[in-house]
């Protein structure tokens, strides 16, 4: 293959890969024919001039993991050809001017994951040709205006995980073609108005991990086109009015783990594709009427680990297509009757780990479809006649950690629950709290005679009183519906930034797994 | 005869993090719920968390990112662990749980304590 | 999260005049439909654990004497000691759980 350098392989397809600590230098003599060079996980500490000079050919050159900390500023000579560099997971801490040159068909550049202290507008002013930028995983404290202005045709521009404490609104003035831009894990804590008024085709923003306590009203104005936006884990206190209002496009906005106190009423401007609403983990002590009416192709609504303790009757309104409903670990003591009234199509909801005491009788009327319903950990003494009785595709109940009173009153839902037994799962069963005779006996099981009798007349129940058997075919399938939504928050699709973590009961849905944004 | 013994407690450095057992007995973990309080010396009794029959959780939210509170039915053993100390963390450590009373938060069997010092 | 304060800090009564201890809430605790105030008394001698005395504002828990009575409702709530014993002389606590629990700072009472 024109001349295979030992520690390197070649393939018939013009691609060379060096790799081992055993090279310190880059291998030659490289193939004439090259295209594509890889030099991964070497002891290379420095890149002397232009000792790529006889593969002209070369369209990818990466040069990754190794402990390569300077760069003479000739070294990609001769590259012309070249679409794709990658300099990332080195030990770089300064980048030479003019290192970039010459490289008129570079349309790919990662710098990303070495200590880059700073960039400068001569950087990459000869790079008019570059689409994507990575600079994530640096040490860069600012950008200077100009640094990008050369990059008309920047598609994407990754500038995550660095320590920026303030963006220049200039600096990104002249990125029309911008498509992405991360500035995720920064510490940035404010935006300047107009920051992203010239990126008018981006699709993506990613803003999560900062320090960020105010957004400018119109901060997105301009950015009509935008599909994701994330915001989470910020110190975001209150959102302008407009601060939503021109976001048609948005299908993903991510809100949690920000110290929103409060939502109101049409903050969420209209968002036709709007699928997942991400909210858990703020403040917020109330939701008002209509406050996600313009929702309509709402999914899933998280608003677990908050501390609303108010929900208003018409707070769901417009929600016809939502699916999943998070309220726990909340401090809801009630509930109005028609508060789920809107959400027909509605399969999950969590209201586990609240403080609810009662329940009205008509709180499930109109949501027929409800697969799962999480009551446990509440201060449920008892539930109303046939509160569930309608729910015919309901398969997963939870209603232990609850102080049922199993006096006479509980007869009704006792029965109920003989009969739907595996709607109950088998790990924990509701237990009786009072009378203290016979705390700590399984509900379903109890022998309500035992119980000190109620003081009020029962109501003529309408649960089914029938006993349950084994063997009868009636029951519902025991199959669990808490779908994969329930399990995990929100992953930014983003390779770059996906970091899943373990948490114990205290995660967002209460189960397993959360994505910490 | 209702029983708790708590266990665990002693010097720890700060920054470091504590283990706390509270052995039950004469009734079953899996009937009652078991809280945590904590009262420094000369100070106020301080509600920690709680972790009740079915295994749910609930904590003091100005502590929640530092504790867990865990059980194990079969060893009618409860426990708490409590990360990242602090001189402040220094107090005596109840576990308590409501045996008859009808309050569901209430606490009517307590035990003696365990004594946690925070100090390098 | 409620915050309870009680009154006053420390108290010194004669034996067998009454004692008046107030507990104030940050909030109401009372839940209008079960009609309750979720709030509880505490009782706590020296170098011993603390002893749960009335529960629901007003309900005495069982075994303890009649002497103990808790009043109040909403956010203002009072634990009267009728005729003070020796034995009363102790620390107590108010305690919320409308929310998750609270306790007040507490109030020492002692033998004039």
């Known amino acids: 293959y024109h001349g295979c350098p030992s520690e390197c392989t070649c393939s018939r397809a013009s691609q060379v890969e060096c790799t081992g600590a055993r090279i310190v230098a880059v291998p030659t003599p490289l193939p004439w024919n090259a295209m594509s060079l890889q030099i991964l996980n070497t002891h290379i500490t420095e890149l002397n001039e232009s000792p790529f000079l006889n593969i002209s050919a070369l369209i990818a050159l990466r040069i990754e993991k190794n402990e390569l900390s300077r760069i003479t500023p000739g070294a990609f000579r001769n590259l012309g050809s070249l679409r794709y560099l990658s300099l990332a997971n080195n030990k770089l801490q300064v980048l030479p001017i003019g290192l970039f040159q010459g490289l008129d068909s570079l349309e790919s550049l990662l710098l990303s994951s070495n200590q880059l202290l700073q960039i400068q507008p001569a950087h990459f002013s000869q790079c008019s040709n570059l689409k994507e930028l990575q600079l994530h995983g640096n040490h860069l404290e600012y950008i200077p205006d100009g640094a990008f202005d050369h990059l008309v045709g920047l598609t994407k521009l990754n500038l995550g995980k660095n320590s920026l404490t303030h963006i220049s609104p200039r600096v990104f003035q002249h990125l029309g073609n911008l498509q992405v831009l991360r500035l995720y894990e920064n510490r940035l804590t404010d935006i300047p108005m107009g920051t992203f008024d010239g990126l008018v085709n981006l699709q993506e923003l990613a803003l999560q991990q900062n320090q960020i306590g105010l957004l400018s009203p119109g901060l997105f104005h301009n950015n009509h086109n935008l599909q994701r936006l994330y915001l989470s884990n910020n110190h975001i206190s209150q959102l302008p009015p407009s601060v939503f209002m021109q976001l048609p496009q948005l299908n993903r906005l991510t809100l949690f783990g920000n110290s929103l106190k409060e939502l109101s009423p049409g903050i969420f401007g209209p968002m036709p594709n709007l699928r997942e609403l991400w909210l858990y983990d703020n403040h917020i002590s109330s939701l008002p009427d209509n406050v996600f009416s313009n929702l309509r192709q709402l999914q899933v609504l998280i608003l677990s680990r908050n501390q609303i303790s108010f929900i208003s009757p018409g707070a769901f309104n417009g929600l016809t297509e939502l699916r999943e409903l998070s309220l726990h670990t909340n401090a809801l003591q009630d509930l109005d009757g028609n508060v789920f009234r809107m959400l027909a199509n509605l399969q999950n909801i969590s209201l586990q780990n609240n403080r609810l005491r009662q329940l009205p009788g008509n709180i499930f009327a109109n949501v027929n479809g409800l697969m799962a319903i999480q009551l446990q950990n509440n201060q449920l003494e008892n539930l109303p006649l046939g509160i569930f009785d309608h729910l015919g595709k309901l398969c997963e109940l939870r209603l232990y950690d609850n102080p049922w009173r199993c006096d006479s009153d509980i007869l009704p839902l006792r029965n109920w629950l003989l009969l739907n037994q595996p709607r109950l799962g088998t790990d924990t069963v509701p237990v009786c709290f009072s009378p203290a005779n016979v705390r700590g006996q399984s509900l379903i099981i109890i022998n309500v005679n035992v119980a000190v009798p109620s003081v009020h007349v029962p109501e003529v129940p309408s649960y089914p009183e029938t006993p349950w058997y084994p063997d009868t075919p009636s029951y519902p399938d025991t199959t669990s519906v808490s779908s994969t939504t329930e399990l995990t928050s929100p992953v930014e699709d983003y390779t770059d930034l996906t970091t899943i973590q373990v948490t114990d009961d205290r995660s967002v849905w209460g189960m397993t797994q959360a994505q910490s944004g | 005869e209702v029983q708790l013994v708590e266990s665990g407690g002693g010097l720890v450095q700060p920054g470091g993090s504590l283990r706390l057992s509270c052995a039950v007995s004469?009734?079953?973990?899996?009937?009652?719920?078991v809280h945590w309080v904590r009262q420094a010396t000369g100070k106020g009794l301080e509600w920690l968390g709680v972790i009740w029959a079915g295994g749910s959780t609930n904590y003091n939210s100005a502590l929640m990112s530092r504790l867990t509170i865990s059980k194990e039915n079969a060893k009618s053993s409860v426990y708490l662990q409590m990360n990242s100390l602090r001189a402040g963390d220094t107090a005596m450590y109840y576990c308590?749980?409501?045996?008859?009373?009808?309050?569901?938060?209430?606490?009517?069997?307590w035990g003696q304590g365990t004594t946690v010092t925070v100090s390098s | 999260d409620i915050v309870m304060t009680q009154s006053p800090d420390s108290l010194a009564v004669s034996l067998g005049e009454r004692a008046t201890i107030n507990c104030k809430s940050s909030?109401?605790?009372?839940?209008?439909?079960?009609?309750?105030?979720?709030l509880a008394w505490y009782q706590q001698k020296p170098g011993q654990s603390p002893k749960l005395l009335i529960y629901w504002a007003s309900t005495r828990e069982s075994g303890v004497p009649d002497r103990f009575s808790g009043s109040g409702s909403g956010t203002d709530f009072t634990l009267t000691i009728s005729s003070l014993q020796a034995e009363d002389v102790a620390v107590y606590y108010c305690k919320q759980s409308y929310n998750l629990p609270t306790f007040g700072g507490g109030t020492k009472v002692e033998i004039k």
């Open positions: 909030q109401s605790l009372l839940n209008s439909r079960t009609r309750k105030n979720y």
């Open positions: 004469g009734f079953s973990l899996t009937s009652y719920g």
């Open positions: 308590a749980t409501h045996m008859h009373t009808e309050d569901y938060y209430g606490m009517d069997y």
